[in-house]
């Protein structure tokens, strides 16, 4: 086999702005961000990242993961809860370009979804979304 | 159709699974008009510990 499992497959939404994987640097004040490489190894949270080009990311050290007995969701030591969300968009058609973050279709849909979640969860507790994946319905 | 899977992050203690789903479902009509996204089949769950791409994407990696 050859090649490498890579490609930006994450976005970070924070403080009312959408940091698209392909354009905008992630805020360094953000308590977390998600590595953009969509790889075959488990992804953990990096303390911050700096986007440098279309789909590569440089990461700082990974903070320790901790569990808590009094929470409904796992957290980092920074006190973050995570939720997995899945839904169908019935008026859109899947195509292969949704597997690649450098394509226009991927970027446009990712941007709309990121903006939508900022609208939905306006309250102060929302930190962001990550690891967006599209597949056929 | 397109299935979207993602992870949401919140400050600890500010929201639970039920409220995440409720707020999302309440926004579906506006999503259709504002973003032209017709949303259905919403599912929300806690990310299993330890946090990883493999676990929260149901081993899609």
């Amino acid at each position: 086999a050859s090649g490498s499992a890579s490609g930006s497959a994450s976005t970070l939404v924070h403080n009312g702005t959408s940091a698209r994987a392909t354009t905008t640097p992630a805020s360094k004040s953000t308590p977390f961000s998600i590595p953009s490489h969509h790889s075959d190894t488990p992804t953990t949270l990096a303390s911050h990242s700096t986007k440098t080009d279309a789909s590569s990311t440089h990461h700082s050290s990974v903070p320790p993961l901790t569990s808590s007995n009094h929470s409904t969701s796992p957290q980092l030591s920074t006190g973050v809860s995570f939720f997995f969300l899945s839904f169908h968009i019935s008026n859109l058609q899947f195509n292969s370009s949704l597997e690649d973050p450098s394509t226009d279709y991927y970027q446009e849909l990712q941007r709309d979804i990121s903006e939508m979640f900022l609208q939905i969860y306006k309250q102060g507790g929302f930190l962001g979304l990550s690891n967006i994946k599209f597949r056929p319905g | 159709s397109v299935v979207v899977q993602l992870t949401l992050a919140f400050r600890e203690g500010t929201i639970n699974v039920h409220d995440v789903e409720t707020q999302f479902n309440q926004y579906k009509t506006e999503a259709a008009s504002r973003y032209n996204l017709t949303i259905s089949d919403v599912s929300v769950s806690d990310v299993p510990f330890p946090f990883s791409a493999q676990s929260h994407h149901h081993h899609h990696h």
């Epitope: 392909t22 075959d40 450098s102 056929p136 | -």
Partner: antibody, heavy 117, light 107 residues
Framework: EVQLVQSGAEVKKPGASVKVSCKAS????????INWVRQRPGQGLEWIGY????????EYNEKFKGRVTLTSDTSASTAYMELSSLRSEDTAVYYC??????????WGQGTLVTVSS | DIQLTQSPSSLSASVGDRVTITCRAS??????LNWLQQKPGKAIKRLIY???SLDSGVPSRFSGSRSGSDYTLTISSLQPEDFATYYC?????????FGGGTKVEIK
């Protein structure tokens, strides 16, 4: 380690069909798409089509529509490319290439299909 | 269909040389271009994705860039293992298409 292992070389007569397999290991099979590409002797690369594994979603190059069928068997972690009504100009090495967060990330070793009477 | 015109079709170079291969796209493809390496009897290997991003495990002497509709693969200092054929690939729109290839040979 991610691997795409393709089936062995085939010799077929004109008018026959060939089915090339691409077995995936090292990752969960239903997560990604597979593209199929061919290379005729001494020529460049030509895209045939795409299948999202574990679904019936496919895309085809118009040039091959009606002659090529892409399928997958999730239980066997294998994708298949079947080309029918073979002619001599279909003699080529056929490759599968998987996505991994981006397209064409990993490639199989190729399968030589020879069409000869 | 989008045409990718790759040049040169072949080149002879020595170890240590700087090598540049260019692909020109007939339509706007944004950054949706990969560079592939093919060696006889080996699986094709992707070197660069999304115009300029280096795949993991690929030596840093390989780099990709874009100027308008021209896309460039540069090998800053050619090594013995770099003698191969290189292809560009666009995935902006279906059908996905490839450049004609550049064979890098030993001078």
């Amino acid at each position: 380690e991610v691997q795409l292992v393709q089936s062995g070389a085939e010799v077929k007569k004109p008018g026959a069909s060939v089915k090339v397999s691409c077995k995936a290991s090292g990752y969960t099979f239903t997560s990604y798409g597979i593209n199929w590409v061919r290379q005729r002797p001494g020529q460049g690369l030509e895209w045939i089509g795409y299948i999202y594994l574990g679904s019936d979603y496919t895309e085809y190059n118009e040039k091959f529509k009606g002659r090529v069928t892409l399928t997958s068997d999730t239980s066997a972690s294998t994708a298949y490319m079947e080309l029918s009504s073979l002619r001599s100009e279909d003699t080529a090495v056929y490759y599968c290439a998987r996505s991994a967060g981006s397209l064409f990330a990993y490639w199989g070793q190729g399968t030589l299909v020879t069409v000869s009477s | 269909d989008i045409q990718l015109t790759q040049s040169p079709s072949s080149l002879s170079a020595s170890v240590g040389d700087r090598v540049t291969i260019t692909c020109r796209a007939s339509q706007d493809i944004g950054i949706t271009l990969n560079w592939l390496q093919q060696k006889p009897g080996k699986a094709i290997k992707r070197l660069i994705y999304a115009t300029s991003s280096l795949d993991s495990g690929v030596p840093s002497r390989f780099s990709g860039s874009r100027s308008g509709s021209d896309y460039t693969l540069t090998i800053s200092s050619l090594q013995p293992e770099d003698f191969a054929t290189y292809y560009c690939l666009q995935y902006a729109s279906s059908p996905y298409t490839f450049g004609g290839g550049t064979k890098v040979e030993i001078k």
